[in-house]
Interface confidence: medium
C-alpha cells in the first residue's frame, strides 16, 4: 500500500511550519558600524549588534561564519533592547568584508542579521581623519553607547541539548519523508510500467504532486540548513573539534581580524587595555 501524496504533503508542510515557528520566536538582530562602513586604513571601527532583552551572548560573524567573535558583555540599550559592541582598533585591508550578527537567548540562537559590508580605503588624512561614511546599519538605526571596555570574549558555548533534540528530530522526520517519497516514486514507476493511465489528467497529476512535495521539502531543508544545522558547527567547542572529530579542522590565525572588543570612545585609562590575547585562533571545520 502506497502513502497518499496529500498526506505526505501535509506532513511536509507541518514540518516546514514547525521549523518556521521556531525561527519566529526570536527577532532578528541588527548590525551597524560606527563611525561608518567606509573606513580609512589605520582608523578604528566598532560593530554594534543589537537584539531583544535577555540576550546572553552576541556573536559577530565574518564572511559567512568562517571567523567569529563572541561576547557576553551585553549592555542594555533600552528597557526593551540589548546590544554588544565589537571594536577593531586599527583597520587593515584584511578587515574588509561582510559581517553579520547572531545572538544566543536561552534556549536557542537567533537568525543572522543582514550582512553589513565593511570597505577599507587608503587615506591621506591619517588615522583620525573623519573621512568616513556616517554610521551605517543593517536593521534599525543604531546609536553610540557604553563607553567602557569589554574585557574578554568568551569561547562559544557548546551545542545545547535542546538544539540537539530539535536537530535530531528534524533530521529523522526529514529522512522519513525522503524515504516515503522514494518509495512513492518507485511505486508510481511500477504502476506506469504495468499499464497506461486511464486519462491524460491522471498521467500528469502523480508527476506534479511529488514535485511539489520535493520542492517544499527542499525549501524546508534549506531553512533547516540556514538556521539549524550549521549551528552545530558554530557551537561546537574548538577543543571538541580538534580532539578527534571526523571533520578536518583548520586553525585560522585571526591576526588581521584583531577584534579588541573595545567600545568606540575610550574614556578611562582602563579602556586602553588590550584583550588578553590579541591574536585569536578560530577552528574552522572543513567538510
Amino acid at each position: 500500500m502506497s502513502p497518499h501524496p496529500t498526506a505526505l504533503l501535509g506532513l511536509v508542510l507541518c514540518l516546514a511550519q514547525t521549523i518556521h515557528t521556531q525561527e519566529e520566536d526570536l527577532p532578528r538582530p541588527s548590525i551597524s558600524a560606527e563611525p561608518g562602513t567606509v573606513i580609512p586604513l589605520g582608523s578604528h571601527v566598532t560593530f554594534v549588534c543589537r537584539g531583544p532583552v535577555g540576550v546572553q551572548t552576541f556573536r559577530l560573524e565574518r564572511d559567512s561564519r568562517s571567523t567569529y567573535n563572541d561576547t557576553e558583555d551585553v549592555s542594555q540599550a533600552s528597557p526593551s533592547e540589548s546590544e554588544a559592541r565589537f571594536r577593531i582598533d586599527s583597520v587593515r585591508e584584511g578587515n574588509a568584508g561582510l559581517y553579520r550578527c547572531i545572538y544566543y537567548k536561552p534556549p536557542k540562537w537567533s537568525e543572522q542579521s543582514d550582512y553589513l559590508e565593511l570597505l577599507v580605503k587608503e587615506s591621506s588624512g591619517g588615522p583620525d581623519s573623519p573621512d568616513t561614511e556616517p554610521g551605517s546599519s543593517a536593521g534599525p538605526t543604531q546609536r553610540p553607547s557604553d563607553n567602557s571596555h569589554n574585557e574578554h570574549a568568551p569561547a562559544s558555548q557548546g551545542l545545547k541539548a535542546e538544539h540537539l533534540y530539535i536537530l535530531i528530530g528534524v533530521s529523522v522526520v526529514f529522512l522519513f519523508c525522503l524515504l516515503l517519497l522514494v518509495l512513492f516514486c518507485l511505486h508510481r514507476q511500477n504502476q506506469i510500467k504495468q499499464g497506461p493511465p486511464r486519462s491524460k489528467d491522471e498521467e500528469q497529476k502523480p508527476q506534479q504532486r511529488p514535485d511539489l512535495a520535493v520542492d517544499v521539502l527542499e525549501r524546508t531543508a534549506d531553512k533547516a540548513t540556514v538556521n539549524g544545522l550549521p549551528e552545530k558547527d558554530r557551537e561546537t567547542d574548538t577543543s571538541a573539534l580538534a580532539a578527534g572529530s571526523s571533520q578536518e579542522v583548520t586553525y585560522a590565525q585571526l591576526d588581521h581580524w584583531a577584534l579588541t572588543q573595545r567600545t568606540a570612545r575610550a574614556v578611562s585609562p582602563q579602556s586602553t587595555k588590550p584583550m588578553a590575547e590579541s591574536i585569536t585562533y578560530a577552528a574552522v571545520a572543513r567538510h
Epitope: 546572553q56 526593551s80 546609536r143 563607553n147
Partner: antibody, heavy 113, light 108 residues
C-alpha cells in the same frame, strides 16, 4: 508577577559599609539587567550603575565607581549593592530597577553617628 | 555627560485637563528616552520607552513624542492618581544614564 523585594531600612555610622539587597521573582533573573538608583530626600533620581546578572558584568556612573559595588547571586535571584566609606551624603533611598521597567520599593539608608 | 532639562519644574492642572511636560537634552539622543512617574511616597514607575512606546499596563491617556533634543510627555485627560513627579531619562549615551530634574504635577 514580577517583583523586586528590597531589604529593610539601614542605619549606619560614617566610615562603615552596608550591603543592600534586591530579591527578584516572577521572571528569569539572568535575562534582565539590574540597575540601582539613588534618591536623596526631596531630590531627583540619580543612576548609580547596573549589573548583568548572567555574566556579572557591571557598568557604573563614574561618580559612584569608588562608592558602590554591584554583585548578583544567580542561585537566589538576588542583586546586591555594597556602599563603602559611608558619609552623610549617602543618606538616601536606594532603588533597584529591572531594566527600568520594574522598580523595587526602595531601601532607606540613614548615615548617622 | 548628557544633561536633561525638564520644564516646568512644577505645575498645577485641573482634573480632565490636557497636560504636557517637556524635556530637552544637551545633544541629540536619538529618541532613547523614557518617562518615569513617581507618586508621593512611592517608588518610581516607567511609563514610556523609546520616546513614544507605552510600557505594558500604562493607561493610554499617557503618550510620548519628540526626537533629536526635544521630547514631551502628554496626559490627555488628567486624573487624580496622576499627581506626582515625572522624570525623563536618557539612555543614548551611557554610562551614565541621566535623569531630568523632575516636574512636580499637582492638582488645582
Amino acid at each position: 508577577q514580577v517583583q523586586l523585594q528590597q531589604s529593610g531600612a539601614e542605619l549606619a555610622k560614617p566610615g562603615a559599609s552596608v550591603k543592600l539587597s534586591c530579591k527578584a521573582s516572577g521572571y528569569t533573573f539572568t535575562s534582565y539587567w539590574m540597575h540601582w538608583v539613588k534618591q536623596r530626600p526631596g531630590q531627583g533620581l540619580e543612576w548609580i550603575g547596573y549589573i548583568n546578572p548572567f555574566s556579572g558584568h557591571t557598568k557604573y556612573n563614574q561618580k559612584f565607581k569608588d562608592k558602590a559595588t554591584l554583585t548578583a547571586d544567580k542561585s537566589s535571584s538576588t542583586a546586591y549593592m555594597q556602599l563603602s566609606s559611608l558619609t552623610y551624603e549617602d543618606s538616601a533611598v536606594y532603588y533597584c530597577a529591572r531594566n527600568f521597567d520594574q522598580w523595587g520599593q526602595g531601601t532607606t539608608l540613614t548615615v548617622s553617628s | 555627560d548628557i544633561k536633561m532639562t525638564q520644564s516646568p519644574s512644577s505645575m498645577y492642572a485641573s482634573l480632565g485637563e490636557r497636560v504636557t511636560i517637556t524635556c530637552k537634552a544637551s545633544q541629540d539622543i536619538n529618541s532613547y528616552l523614557s518617562w518615569v512617574q513617581q507618586k508621593p511616597g512611592k517608588s518610581p514607575k516607567t511609563l514610556i520607552d523609546r520616546a513614544n512606546r507605552l510600557v505594558d499596563g500604562v493607561p493610554s491617556r499617557f503618550s510620548g513624542s519628540g526626537s533629536g533634543q526635544d521630547y514631551s510627555l502628554t496626559i490627555s485627560s488628567l486624573e487624580y492618581e496622576d499627581m506626582g513627579i515625572y522624570y525623563c531619562l536618557q539612555y543614548d549615551e551611557f554610562p551614565p544614564y541621566t535623569f531630568g530634574g523632575g516636574t512636580k504635577l499637582e492638582i488645582k
